[in-house]
């Protein structure tokens, strides 16, 4: 018979034949042959593989480093990685939760809608037209543009979401 060019789901092609992939939680020891099945071995303690695979090494479980404020939210198994979270009152810097911050700051152009608490991180909002923020802050709201008119001045430079307007003297009519 013709050697296969593609294999079924949960199989892989090697040496012109289809071998079974190793199930999650196991790694490949040896490929199948004409006469033998794929040989797989369970991952060791603190290791995992989360897909049907032909990996020869299992992945190490993530380490939740307490020096970075991390703790284990969910212990890893042979099929799943460890999930880290931050100590109470702290917040993950990313979805992967690789480090912790007390709270995040809102970038220039954004103001603080709600200051962080023990359970929720800072909530930022974009500065609307007429408001600006030129700093990174965990407490400052967007500030309204300066009103040049109330100072008997005119707008020399328009404001943006990151900068205030620049006011200047009114042009005097020449006689």
């Amino acid at each position: 018979p013709e050697p296969p060019t593609a294999c079924r789901e949960k199989q892989y092609l090697i040496n012109s034949q289809c071998c079974s992939l190793c199930q999650p939680g196991q790694k490949l020891v040896s490929d199948c042959t004409e006469f033998t099945e794929t040989e797989c071995l369970p991952c060791g303690e603190s290791e995992f593989l989360d897909t049907w695979n032909r990996e020869t090494h299992c992945h190490q479980h993530k380490y939740c480093d307490p020096n970075l404020g991390l703790r284990v939210q969910q212990k890893g198994t042979s099929e799943t990685d460890t999930i880290c979270t931050c100590e109470e009152g702290w917040h993950c810097t990313s979805e992967a939760c690789e480090s912790c911050v007390l709270h995040r700051s809102c970038s220039p152009g954004f103001g603080v809608k709600q200051i962080a608490t023990g359970v929720s991180d800072t909530i930022c909002e974009p500065c609307p037209v007429g408001f600006f923020s030129n700093v990174s802050s965990a407490f400052e709201k967007c500030h309204p543009w300066t009103s040049c008119e109330t100072k008997d001045l005119v707008v020399q430079q328009a404001g943006t979401n990151k900068t205030d307007v620049v006011c200047g003297p009114q042009d005097r009519l020449r006689a």
């Epitope: 404020g69 931050c86 480090s99 912790c100 709270h103």
Partner: nanobody
Framework: EVQLLESGGGLVQPGGSLRLSCAAS???????EMWWVRQAPGKGLERVS?????????YYADSVKGRFTISRDDSKNTLYLQMNSLRAEDTAVYYC?????????WGQGTLVTVSS
């Protein structure tokens, strides 16, 4: 790497005053937003007060408004918290924090006990 060292805590009677200091080493605090945060025994972290990098804007939690004053002296690389009219519920370990507020910047804190 910045290190923050809080000091000035102690035992004080209700109605008394204390001034906390936070001295930074290894990095300047100039231009950086700074916070005072506290943790009462068996409670979570509470954000008490903050000051902008310029010193022009401040924030106070409702629980300390009118009693606490935050200030900074960038030439001394130090943040302060003046605490007046202290109450039993102000008893906590007080920490200072510097933008970007990483856990590994966290100091040891200074314990404030308000008791008669």
């Amino acid at each position: 790497e910045v290190q923050l060292l809080e000091s000035g805590g102690g035992l004080v009677q209700p109605g008394g005053s204390l001034r906390l200091s936070c001295a930074a080493s290894g990095s300047t605090i100039a231009g950086y937003e700074m916070w005072w945060v506290r943790q009462a025994p068996g409670k979570g972290l509470e954000r008490v007060s903050a000051i902008s990098g310029s010193g022009g804007s401040t924030y106070y939690a409702d629980s300390v408004k009118g009693r606490f004053t935050i200030s900074r002296d960038d030439s001394k690389n130090t943040l302060y918290l003046q605490m007046n009219s202290l109450r039993a519920e102000d008893t906590a370990v007080y920490y200072c924090a510097k933008d970007p507020y990483s856990f590994d910047y966290w100091g040891q804190g200074t314990l404030v006990t308000v008791s008669s």
